[in-house]
Amino acid sequence: FNISGCSTKKLLWTYSTRSEEEFVLFCDLPEPQKSHFCHRNRLSPKQVPEHLPFMGSNDLSDVQWYQQPSNGDPLEDIRKSYPHIIQDKCTLHFLTPGVNNSGSYICRPKMIKSPYDVACCVKMILEVKPQTNASCEYSASHKQDLLLGSTGSISCPSLSCQSDAQSPAVTWYKNGKLLSVERSNRIVVDEVYDYHQGTYVCDYTQSDTVSSWTVRAVVQVRTIVGDTKLKPDILDPVEDTLEVELGKPLTISCKARFGFERVFNPVIKWYIKDSDLEWEVSVPEAKSIKSTLKDEIIERNIILEKVTQRDLRRKFVCFVQNSIGNTTQSVQLKEKRG
């Protein structure tokens, strides 16, 4: 299709080489089509647009994204060619940063139902640059945490080094929806609830003598509880002896509960004590079996192909540790009688 009639928007993504970060493009269809199509309207539910020249479907995923190759080749369907780019409804998610993401991205409705719809498209020219060392050293992170029940704030990473006074007007989105009341480089939250968690996008306009473009940053916000003050506790094994049959295979499971920590480096491992010798056992990887806001339960198994006489004199020790401290639980195998 002819993209010359598409509205054009220029965006800049300056990414930090020190951290993982994501980026999004919204299918900013011209008003009022956008409101009908992607449900990102600025209108209140009682206000109805006077005319809807674009009669697209209400299905939120009925948008098609393309990339325009720089060499003039035909448009490429994003879904087929770019595994690190994911389409979610009217949003395009870039999972990994890199200058190779620079280029022109076009979105338009899948269903063309009227002659007006042909021109219903947006071309976004995205420029991606790594942050230079000259940039602000202490810029806000692209992953920010809000402590539940307390006050907090969400800072726009690309503007966090500027004072509120010199900051340009900022447009904020949360999970793709416009936050119309927020215009500064920082969103202040009086009391943090779990619904404050989500993907926030901050946009501001930067201009030079030639052109203007939108500088965009994406912030993943987590609502968290305070760091635990407790070392992990072992939920299983509970008993310090276990009845077994010689010659049979055996799996002993160690399940431990770790309280929430912002910087979470849980350790769960098995080691064997034989007399006063001890060594760590190479066992299958640990797996998380339950995760809540407050804690996480992690499991790791030790597998014996067959229980030998030697195993009966050994102690099998599960060791768990977080930043507060460690806990151990040892199991002695006992031969089943009869």
Epitope: I272, D274, D276, L277, E278, W279, V281, Q309, R310, R313
Partner: antibody, heavy 120, light 108 residues
């Protein structure tokens, strides 16, 4: 591999320190480093072992306590200090790694031995 | 201290025959028992560990058995290369350790 050194001709009542150097591995808590000796034409005699981990617990044959001292000099060397030597201590002294490897399999390694002769 | 008593001190066997060596500990050593083979001029070689487990690379004609205080090494289908001196050892170092006096195996 293990290599013993320090074997020598020593006078009765003299002292001597033997050194065992490990190459290809460093000490860990899954095994012991031991000393065993064998007098010419005789059987094997266990002297002492030291836990190769941080505990450094040392165990001695009853007859060796007081005269012989086993210690870890570094993460790859263990020594045996012997005092009040007599002709009966004349033997080839072997350094032995005994215990388990990192996978819990038994691991037993002997050095070639070093000869200690006690004579006036 | 643990004392290990090994019998016999010498045994001769024909090629293809069977040799049995016994070892008695002065107290329960919880199967912390090793058997070694030693040939003249060489350090000993581990044959059996934990009373009954065959060490890596050791032929299956060597078999260890026993528990508590009584242990046995059996060599079935004796070969010329089996001529050597065999030692049992308590390797329960934390409880004290000791070698047996040795058994010389002569193959005819």
């Amino acid at each position: 591999s293990l290599e013993e050194s320090g074997g020598d001709l020593v006078k009765p009542e003299g002292s001597l320190t033997l050194t065992c150097t490990a190459s290809g591995f460093s000490f860990s808590s899954s095994y012991y480093m031991c000393w065993v000796r064998q007098a010419p034409g005789k059987g094997l005699e266990w002297i002492a072992c030291i836990h190769a981990g941080s505990s450094g617990a040392a165990y001695y044959a009853t007859w060796a306590k007081g005269r012989f001292t086993i210690s870890k000099a570094s993460s790859t060397t263990v020594t045996l200090h012997m005092t009040s030597l007599t002709a009966a201590d004349t033997a080839t002294y072997f350094c032995v790694r005994d215990g388990y490897d990192d996978y819990g399999d038994p691991f037993n390694l002997w050095g070639p031995g070093t000869l200690v002769t006690v004579s006036s | 201290a643990i004392k290990m008593t090994q019998t016999p001190s010498s045994v001769s066997a024909a090629v293809g025959g069977t040799v049995t060596i016994n070892c008695r500990a002065s107290e329960d050593i919880k199967s912390y028992l090793a058997w070694y083979q030693q040939k003249p001029g060489q350090p000993p070689k581990l044959l059996i560990y934990d009373a009954s487990d065959l060490a890596s690379g050791v032929p299956s004609r060597f078999k260890g058995s026993g528990s508590g205080t009584e242990y046995t090494l059996t060599i079935s289908g004796v070969q010329c290369d089996d001529a050597a001196t065999y030692y049992c050892q308590s390797v329960w170092y934390a409880g004290g350790a000791a070698f047996g006096g040795g058994t010389e195996v002569v193959v005819q």
